[in-house]
Amino acid sequence: LMGGQDKPFLSARPSTVVPRGGHVALQCHYRRGFNNFMLYKEDRSHVPIFHGRIFQESFIMGPVTPAHAGTYRCRGSRPHSLTGWSAPSNPLVIMVTGNHRKPSLLAHPGPLLKSGETVILQCWSDVMFEHFFLHREGISEDPSRLVGQIHDGVSKANFSIGPLMPVLAGTYRCYGSVPHSPYQLSAPSDPLDIVITGLYEKPSLSAQPGPTVQAGENVTLSCSSWSSYDIYHLSREGEAHERRLRAVPKVNRTFQADFPLGPATHGGTYRCFGSFRALPCVWSNSSDPLLVSVTGNPSSSWPSPTEPSSKSGICRHLH
């Protein structure tokens, strides 16, 4: 962690990206411990609070304002040196969000991807942002930054993520910044959940009373596996939402979830996936597709699930 023998390491918890009005803890790690330290802001704005003050273990900053955005350093206590303080730490950039209208975030080819594939996350806005930042929820490292490209009154940036591994799955948000205020970021885009499939064995998908049903007949799709999945996800081809249910252990030692679809109207092709609570964005291989056919006179479409939408909170735990 240390940048040199006499150089402390400054870090932020939970993240260097802080919403306006939020709080962040700055830790100055020096000589294998958290000692007393002093804090500096490089642009010297908004520092009256630091003048002559010594902090112990961590500094809790907030509620933050745009003026808090910028580059910070710390010096660790070193009682027997000439100055009493260490050399300055690494620079730490604190970015404050919520200062401009939110951009939009899209995934190409889509948010549901196989392990090893690459996804392009496109952040765009009609605000002329100079830079775009991409941040994954729960990560304390600095967000990725790209220069915005401006075409036809729209600024955008394409972030390439891949080859995809479990560690890259999760909830992404992007932000924009305007010239002259590089660390005062926009409000976050709507969250986009990137799901990686193909990591575990596929579950099996079956229909009760069967895959061919009369119009108006109640249908239940059952997803099951010998693997101890915590959650099952059911998707329907061509639709933008997935359904999820908690898996229930059965007497035959399988783990199963039963998705009631209600009275049959239209058929469709369904798939299901399993996932574990600890990694909600990492899914199994897809079950074999199940074609549900409806005989008789269909009237309107089923209220049905499927491919995960970016707003469905897939990567949040199911409580």
Epitope: V24, Q27, P48, I49, H51, I60, M61, G62, P63
Partner: antibody, heavy 118, light 107 residues
Framework: QVQLVQSGSELKKPGASVKVSCKAS????????MQWVQKSPGQGLEWMGW????????KYAEDFKGRFVFSLDTSVSTAYLQISSLKAEDTAVYFC???????????WGQGTTVTVSS | DIQMTQSPSFLSASVGDRVTITCKAS??????VAWYQQKPGQPPKLLIY???TRHTGVPDRFSGSGSGTDYTLTISSLQAEDVAVYYC?????????FGGGTKVEIK
């Protein structure tokens, strides 16, 4: 939304102890601190000190050193104020408030009335 | 310790009036001043911090200004629901200290 819920009113005899709790919700407990403020009858607001919920390090104002102890249970997102050897002059409403090293108290608990009387 | 002297201690005004409360610090507090509103039977609520930054959800009729030792809270158009005690607080150096409060009533 951020919420701080304090324990109920207490009636104590001089010399006894009291422990006031402040349960936080709606934010990550360890990214902010908990300040404690006293409002005595007919008096203004007086800052007692605070505890850094990230490091667990407390800091006390001069008038509140000794008999007053701040503590945390981060597993239940709760801060505590314990007052020992209670005196009649400790009769007051005690508030917890979210805040950090910058001293801004952005959300407050509803207050806990402690009455010390023989 | 830094003393915060608030004035007036009591203020009566009509609905729609512009109301000004002042706070004087015993030394320069470098814009580190917050303002709180406390309604009867309720805890204080943060209105303004860093002299002029409005807290989330605070109506824009509340504004703050000042520098050095002199700070002001202004209510541009007093509403019935603004009846409360208002406190200033310096958050420049510990111990954080509050003004004595200004009680605002409707005429």
């Amino acid at each position: 939304q951020v919420q701080l819920v304090q324990s109920g009113s207490e009636l104590k005899k001089p010399g006894a102890s009291v422990k006031v709790s402040c349960k936080a919700s709606g934010y990550t407990f360890t990214t902010a601190g908990m300040q404690w403020v006293q409002k005595s009858p007919g008096q203004g607001l007086e800052w007692m000190g605070w505890i850094n919920s990230h490091s667990g390090v407390p800091k006390y104002a001069e008038d509140f050193k000794g008999r007053f102890v701040f503590s945390l249970d981060t597993s239940v997102s709760t801060a505590y104020l314990q007052i020992s050897s209670l005196k009649a002059e400790d009769t007051a409403v005690y508030f917890c408030a979210r805040g950090g090293d910058e001293g801004v108290m952005d959300y407050w608990g509803q207050g806990t009335t402690v009455t010390v009387s023989s | 310790d830094i003393q915060m002297t608030q004035s007036p201690s009591f203020l009566s005004a009509s609905v729609g009036d512009r109301v000004t409360i002042t706070c004087k610090a015993s030394q320069d507090v470098s814009t580190a001043v917050a303002w709180y509103q406390q309604k009867p039977g309720q805890p204080p609520k943060l209105l303004i911090y860093w002299t002029s930054t409005r807290h989330t959800g605070v109506p824009d009729r509340f504004s703050g200004s000042g520098s050095g030792t002199d700070y002001t809270l202004t209510i541009s158009s007093l509403q019935a629901e603004d009846v409360a005690v208002y406190y200033c607080q310096q958050h420049y150096s510990t111990p954080w200290t509050f003004g004595g409060g200004t009680k605002v009533e409707i005429k």
